[in-house]
């Protein structure tokens, strides 16, 4: 028998520095977690103690903090090289700055293979990107070899900016021939490493003949065997065992997100490459694990540029940006409109001639808007200003909801109106009218939504049975502020870009902004 240790991360999302327990900015260092310096300490400890170790990343290193905003992926290549990752799969967020924003900072600089079997380049891009990412990689480990085959969510064109010269194929269809090639080469230990979410990970384990282990990402799935060490609630045991169609037991793993945990899986193979046993657990990277001094020093060196960036002007406002709780928790506020407009603008993807865009609607809890921005400071807007407005380090995500769920969400928005509570929704691509004289749960008297399958966008009444795409904060997607109906009834959820980054990019693009209060939210006569 031959034993392999797989160390894995996924959805790190630019958390190069240690974070608080909820993966936001570290405040009290003695209680902070994760970060590449601490990760390196643990990885090195395991490498020294065990003979056959692979360190893998399942995608979405890009996007999530000011580190990515400023360094645009160069930080990912630098620190992943320093940690000596063995392989990485491409995630959807790796395309956030377009293909060039992937090629130059990461693909050309990474000293480890970057993988995806289901992304095919065409046209002029084919020769430019050739060899910079691979469908699979054969890695020597000790006296054996391990094949690693990569995959990426086929929804990436809707979630990011891969352009028109990359085709995202069905994962299973694309993986099988590559696994077959590895088998042809007598590589009999094969890991599928990818970024399509836990459901797809399980399907790959079930359907792709020859895959021995699946290491996934995208869905931020936390798996754990025994008592979990922090706040995350396990979605199942670690590893999650799937019985394949040809009768093999295939371990599937994921390690939550944000570099909070290091996935740790031990696999025992027989001489024919069959998995005999698998066990392990994610390792919580808490403050009991010291930060490696050399990596920490490097982080501090790179950090300097971030501090300078946060005070630079992104653009100007010529109007007061009303982000006060007195406005945003009671009525339409122009800060809410600005943020929602930025959220939609960030999700412009012309992937189908029938649709002007795949999504037109935004909802945003008023309680998530934490500060106004005064235009009387020469109109200057900085990252620092936006960090005061959106201090929680969240993301603006894409969900699919039925009309009936949206109606419930808008009823919840005003179910206890008048108490300055955070659930009051700011909107984009939606016209809502409330009648507060009616009883809670029946206050939405008009709800019109902007069409997507149209050449001239216009507002149509919400259809209860129709499925709509909506951009919203991850806080709402996870049921925050009492929006349990969103969490319970959503049909799909894909995590998006860092909230501040979305707004800062929009302001930089527009240069000068002047959002108005324009009648997106109305109250019927006599009730307000």
């Amino acid at each position: 028998a031959w034993e392999l240790t797989i160390l894995h991360t996924n959805d790190v999302h630019s958390r190069l520095e240690q974070t608080s327990e909820d993966s936001s900015k570290c405040v009290n260092a003695s209680r902070c977690m994760g970060g590449v310096a601490r990760l390196f300490t643990k990885v090195q400890q395991i490498r020294r103690a065990e003979p056959n170790v692979l360190l893998l990343d399942a995608g979405d290193q890009y996007q999530g903090t000011i580190w990515f905003t400023v360094y645009k992926g160069a930080e990912v290549a630098h620190f992943m090289n320093a940690l000596r990752y063995d392989a990485m799969a491409l995630g959807n967020h790796e395309f956030d700055n377009g293909v060039e924003g992937l090629i130059e900072p990461l693909l050309k600089e990474a000293k480890f293979p970057i993988l995806s079997a289901n992304i095919k380049a065409k046209g002029p891009l084919a020769s430019q990107i050739s060899g910079l990412y691979l469908p699979y990689k054969v890695l020597p480990v000790g006296d054996e070899v391990v094949g690693i085959v990569g995959y990426t969510s086929k929804e990436t064109p809707f979630l990011s900016n891969p352009g028109t010269n990359l085709v995202f194929e069905d994962e299973i269809t694309a993986l099988q021939p590559e696994v077959d090639k590895l088998k042809t080469l007598n590589v009999n230990k094969i890991i599928a490493l990818g970024h399509s979410g836990f459901e797809m990970d399980k399907l790959i384990a079930q359907k792709v003949r020859g895959v021995d282990v699946v290491v996934g990402g995208h869905s931020n799935t936390f798996l754990y065997t025994g008592n979990p060490p922090s706040k995350e609630v396990p979605a199942g045991k670690y590893p999650f065992i799937v019985t394949s169609d040809d009768g093999r037991k295939v371990p599937v793993v994921q390690a939550y997100a944000f570099g909070k945990y290091l996935g740790y899986l031990k696999i025992e193979f027989d001489e024919r490459g069959n998995v005999i046993s698998s066990h392990g657990n994610p390792i919580l990277l808490n403050s009991s694990i010291p930060e490696d001094p050399s990596i920490k020093a490097d982080i501090n060196k790179w950090r300097i540029k971030l501090d300078n960036y946060s005070t630079q002007e992104l653009g100007k406002t010529i109007v007061y940006l009303d982000g006060s709780s007195q406005s945003c928790r009671f009525r339409e506020c122009n800060m809410g409109n600005l943020i929602c407009d930025a959220m939609i603008n960030n999700n412009l993807r012309h992937t189908d001639e029938m649709f002007w865009n795949h999504v037109s609607m935004c909802i945003l809890n008023g309680g998530g808007i934490r500060s106004p921005i005064d235009e009387r400071n020469n109109g200057t807007i900085t990252w620092e200003n936006l960090a005061a407005v959106l201090p929680f380090g969240g993301t603006f995500d894409l969900v699919q909801l039925k009309g009936s769920t949206l109606k419930k969400a808008f009823e919840h928005s005003v179910h206890r109106y008048g108490q300055s509570t955070g659930e009051f929704l700011q909107v984009g691509g939606i016209h809502v009218v409330y009648d507060l004289s009616r009883k809670p749960g029946d206050r939405v008297v008009k709800l019109d939504v902007l069409c997507t399958k149209c050449r001239v966008p216009s507002y149509d009444p919400l259809k209860m049975d129709e499925v709509y795409k909506v951009i919203l904060p991850n806080f709402l997607a996870n049921g925050g502020d009492g929006f349990q109906m969103i969490k319970d009834e959503l049909l799909r959820h894909d995590s998006g870009d860092q909230d501040i980054n979305v707004v800062s990019t929009y302001i930089s693009k527009m240069k000068v902004i002047y959002p108005a209060v324009e009648g997106r939210i109305k109250f019927s006569t006599g009730s307000h």
């Epitope: 000293k111 060899g131 090639k181 080469l185």
Partner: antibody, heavy 118, light 107 residues
């Protein structure tokens, strides 16, 4: 675009050793396999061995296990092959070639001509 | 060891013609076959891998086919610059082995 620059022609005496070098650029050395191949005049190619630059793992054609030793220096992105106990049968052009997996050679050096003669 | 046999050491063709170079493996190699072109005084150059996948930048007049034991490299609309030796190689099992080569001459 990747390049592999091999050391110059060698004229050596039988029974001695020689170390050939192959300096690479334009691709990620640490995640590449470097193979060495032999081509006698007007003949086909023979694969000698590969080395995985990232780890130093090697795999040899059994025919050459006592003849060749392959190494890498990652700091200079250079691969080396030492040939020992040379005879006239070792006179050939030796190529280094890059492959990212256990498959095709996508970049080749220009070749080093080795002549073993007394 | 797997023996790769290129039965024609020499082949003659004219500009604009179509020519097929064959390669036979002594045992099943699946599609783990690659074709190289070597011009006089130069290093080999990759043309086809996995029996039929054309390498980036290789003109589409070069086509590979076959699986198992029989493989073919087909050149359509032959050009004068195609004068070269053509080698097949298997990477199904160690040691990797090459065919003896086919020298294509242009009449």
């Amino acid at each position: 675009q990747g390049q592999m620059q091999q050391s110059g022609a060698e004229l050596v005496k039988p029974g001695t050793s020689v170390k050939l070098s192959c300096k690479t650029s334009g691709f990620t050395f640490s995640s590449s396999y470097i193979s060495w191949l032999k081509q006698r005049p007007r003949q086909s190619l023979e694969w000698i061995a590969w080395i995985y630059a990232g780890t130093g793992n090697t795999n040899y054609n059994q025919k050459f296990t006592d003849k060749a030793q392959v190494t890498v220096d990652t700091s200079s992105s250079t691969a080396y092959m030492q040939l020992s106990s040379l005879t006239s049968e070792d006179s050939a052009i030796y190529y280094c070639a890059r492959h990212v997996n256990w498959d095709y050679f996508d970049y080749w050096g220009q070749g080093t001509t080795l002549t073993v003669s007394s | 060891d797997i023996v790769m046999t290129q039965s024609h050491k020499f082949m003659s063709t004219s500009v604009g013609d179509r020519v097929s170079i064959t390669c036979k493996a002594s045992q099943d190699v699946g599609t783990a076959v690659v074709w190289y072109q070597q011009k006089p005084g130069q290093s080999p150059k990759l043309l086809i891998y996995w029996a039929s996948s054309r390498h980036t930048g290789v003109p589409d007049r070069f086509t590979g086919s076959g699986s198992g034991t029989d493989f073919t490299l087909t050149l359509t609309n032959v050009q004068s610059e195609d004068l070269a030796d053509y080698f097949c190689q298997q990477y199904r099992s160690y040691p990797w082995t090459f065919g003896g080569g086919t020298n294509l001459e242009i009449k």
